[in-house]
Each structure stands twice: as C-alpha cells, then as structure tokens.
C-alpha cells in the first residue's frame, strides 16, 4: 500500500484546512491508527490528533476544539483531518503516520500554507499645489502573507516607488505615487490596487486628487465701451477666475469708495442707471487659501451729448 497526501495545502486565514492522508492499501489491509503531528524543522514533533480505528478521534490538548474528522461518510482508510479556523501560527510542516495491518507503518509529510489577505490603507500626501515640483500624492500600504502586490491605476502622469518590510510571518509593502501637480489633475482618481493569492479579487482604494491653484483674474463687461453711457440700466462687471478651493471675490474702487447704489454679488458688480459719478477705476480681488489675484478696469461713463468718444483702459495685475 501507499499513502496519498498533498505536498502543500493552502488555506486562507480563518478558514478550515483539510489535511489529507489516505492509505491506498491492498485488499484485506486495515488501518489501526493515524497519528498527526506538527514537525517543523528544529523543533520536536507536537502531537495534533490521533484517529484510532477503535477509540475514535483524540485531539491533543494544544489543539482541543480545533481538530475534527471530515463529515461522514468516512472511509476507514482515510486519515484526513480538518484543522478549524487556521491561524498564521499553524503554518508549517505536518506529518501523518499510518499504522496498518499487516503491512506496517507509513508516513507522509505536507506543508500547510496560511494565506493572510492584506487590509490595505491609503494615505494622501501633503496638500498638492500648482507650481510645486515632484510631490507625494499618496502612499498605499498592505501587509499580508505572502507579500502582496501594490500597484496604481490612474490616468494621471506620475512615478511610483515601492519598499517592503519583512516580518516574522508576513511582509508589508508600501508604494508611493509622486507627481508634479497641475490644475488638470484636479478631481482625477488615483487608485491603489492590491493583489494577493488570498483575495478573490483585487482590492482597490480610490483617492480623488485635489490640486490647489488660482487662475489669473480678468473682468468682463466693458467689451463695448459705447454701451457705458449716462442713463444706461443694467450695466455690470463680471470678474472671471477659477481655482481650487473655489475662490471668493471682492470688489473695490481704487479712487474712492464704491458709489451708492452699486451692488456687489460675488463675482458681479451691478450698477444702477449710469451717471458720471460711476466713472473710475474698479478692482476685482480674487483669493483662495492658495493665492490671490487682482484685476482692475477703468470705467468712463459717456455723455451722449458729447461728440467725442472716450477711451476705456483695461489693466490686469496680480
């Protein structure tokens, strides 16, 4: 006869491991007992369980409540056992010793591998600001056994670097994603992808990029200077900019206070029916936590009774 087992049994942490040991004997041969022991190199054998043809299953105290026979129907030549709720410390070499009649004793070894699936974590780097050089966008760490694979999935152009730390029974892998921040990256997903044999599918953690920036400011509304004449209603100036975080707007008049009746509504400055007192230099001040910008325009309200048109100057400053 001969023993049938597996060289390696692989199980995921927390699952039950079936340790196979089947005696393929000639007709008339009987199995008296099957003794299971853990036999890691450098350590003495540690008894696990005994399957006895008469006495039944005995589980050694160290494994009490964790070793069972597979459910019926059972073949008397089958010495397989179930190791319940496998933990990382169970990883190692196991031996089954089969005592048969009349053929004598046989033994076989197998290796139990306990896969520890990773629980990845993603940590965003420092705040990203337009104009910075190569900057850490995020780091992703996953620890498992064996070492997990950590990669990145993104449309954003960048560079990655990985490092690994080996522990006694596992390995931690950290991958960093660096980029040169630009406003086009704002709102783009950066996904950490973790692969591991203990996972049914890759684990993915997505981070949305936020890049701080503030565009140049400009003022719209004076494109046709002839519209700015005494008595005109509904005249307005609009300050144009964009940024992350979204900017706030403030209007001032360089050569004095804002005239009465002039309404400030965020990025818009609304005028009452125009009079000559509305002529002057107006400044739009745009700011966010990252930066601030100014744009100024000169308003010259025309008197339709005067023949000569007046020029309007637009000046932008930051």
């Amino acid at each position: 006869g001969e023993l049938e087992t597996s060289d390696v049994v692989t199980v995921v942490l927390g699952q039950d491991a079936k340790l196979p040991c089947f005696y393929r004997g000639d007709s008339g041969e009987q199995v008296g007992q099957v003794a299971w022991a853990r036999v890691d190199a450098g350590e003495g054998a540690q008894e696990l369980a005994l399957l006895h043809s008469k006495y039944g299953l005995h589980v050694s105290p160290a494994y009490e409540g964790r070793v069972e026979q597979p459910p019926p129907p059972r073949n008397p030549l089958d010495g397989s056992v179930l190791l319940r709720n496998a933990v990382q410390a169970d990883e190692g070499e196991y031996e089954c010793r089969v005592s048969t009649f009349p053929a004598g004793s046989f033994q076989a070894r197998l290796r139990l591998r306990v896969l520890v699936p990773p629980l990845p974590s993603l940590n965003p780097g420092p705040a990203l600001e337009e104009g910075q050089g190569l900057t850490l966008a995020a780091s992703c760490t996953a620890e498992g056994s064996p070492a997990p694979s950590v990669t990145w999935d993104t449309e954003v152009k960048g560079t990655t670097s990985s490092r690994s730390f080996k522990h006694s029974r596992s390995a931690a892998v950290t991958s960093e994603f660096h980029l040169v921040p630009s406003r086009s990256m704002n709102g783009q997903p950066l996904t950490c992808v973790v692969s591991h044999p203990g996972l049914l599918q890759d684990q993915r953690i997505t981070h949305i990029l936020h890049v701080s920036f503030l565009a140049e400011a400009s003022v719209r509304g004076l494109e046709d200077q002839n519209l700015w004449h005494i008595g005109r209603e509904g005249a307005m100036l609009k300050c144009l900019s964009e940024g992350q975080p979204p900017p706030s707007y403030n209007w001032t008049r360089l050569d004095g206070p804002l005239p009465s009746g002039v309404r400030v509504d965020g990025d818009t400055l609304g005028f009452p029916p125009l009079t000559t007192e509305h002529s002057g230099i107006y400044v739009c001040h745009v700011s966010n936590e990252f930066s601030s910008r100014d744009s100024q325009v000169t308003v010259d309200v025309l008197d339709p009774q005067e023949d000569s048109g007046k020029q309007v100057d637009l000046v932008s400053a930051s």
């Epitope: 003794a35 008894e47 005995h58 105290p61």
Partner: antibody
Amino acid sequence: EVQLVESGGGLVQPGGSLRLSCAASGYTFDDYDMSWVRQAPGKGLEWVSGIKAHSDNKRYADSVKGRFTISRDNSKNTLYLQMNSLRAEDTAVYYCAREYSDVVDYVSVRTPLDYWGQGTLVTVSS
Amino acid sequence: DIQMTQSPSSLSASVGDRVTITCRASQGISSYLAWYQQKPGKAPKLLIYAASSLQSGVPSRFSGSGSGTDFTLTISSLQPEDFATYYCQQHYTTPPTFGQGTKVEIK
C-alpha cells in the same frame, strides 16, 4: 502468562519515603507503557503515574506531583515508584498495571489497563 | 481533569437479571473508555475497552456501548460470579480518571 508482582509496601511515618517495585514477566516488557494506580481503603481507584515504553515521557496525578517519581529498567523488566514526603492520605493499596498496546507512538493518550498486579499496601501513619 | 460519574452507586439484582450501569464524562472522550470489574481483595480486571470492545477471555454476556459523553455497561444475564464492583475509566486525557464505582449486590 503475563504476571506483575509488586513489592516494597509497608508502614512508614508521615514525611518518610518508600520505593515500590513491580516485576513483570510473560511478555516483552519494553513494548508496553506502564502505570501505577492506587486504592485507599474502602474507596475507588485513582491513577497515580504512568511511563511510556521507550521515551522518557512520565506523567503524574496532581496529588503526587513533585513527591513521587516513576521509572523503569527495561533490562530488568521492572517498574518503580519512588515515594517521598509521604502523607496519611497516600495510604492505599498500590497496583502496577500494564497499558494495552493498541496505540502506537502517541504520547498524548493513555490506553486501558489490561493486566494488573495483586497490589502492595502502603500505610502512612505515625 | 475529566470527571466520570457512574450511576447507580449500588444496585441489588438476582441471578439471570439484565443489569445496566451508566457512566457520563464531563466532556467528550470519543470512545476512549474502559470498564473494569473488581472483587473484594483482588485487583481490577479489564472487561471492555474502546467503549464496546470485549477484552479477550471476558464472557459475551458483558457488553458496552456509547461514545462522546454517555456510556453503558450491560450484563445481559447476571451470573453468581458477576457480583462485584464495576468502574468506568476514561483515558482520553491525562490524568486518566475513574468513576466512583457501582457495587452490584445479590438481592
């Protein structure tokens, strides 16, 4: 025919010592695990100690741990029980017994006691 | 330690009676259970091992059953030489432990 014969019992004062012997014959002594079991007068059976056939694996009941020592000399087919620091509650008939040999090379379990000696009485009294 | 509880502690019966003694373990012991017979002034004698296997030379009127925690020794037809004290013993763990005994007396 399997025979187990105990000797060495007797009267001893509390705190004293005794060494029991068990001479085995009629079978291959070093193929079998052995045990000592005692029975106080009018009481039930209590397992005292056991020793495996070849290994140095020895086990003791909590009540005698640290005071009693089991040993065997396979060349003399003899089992021993060294009893020190004896107490009144150790008074009993001490039996040596052979363990049934149908479990092979597995120390975590003991087996039934298929042959017993006639017993030797140990009396601890002042 | 595993506790073994026998019942009854004693019983009176007549020759020819069917006698049943039960033994309960405080935890599961598979079939790691033996039954012994002891007569006054004599050493115990193994009757049944592995809960239900008859030891060589023991009359077939003795039988055992059970596994796990509950076990039974049955004497199908009591004979005069069967009046004795009977003990169950578990050998699943060390220390092996005995029941307190059941004394079978003549009615």
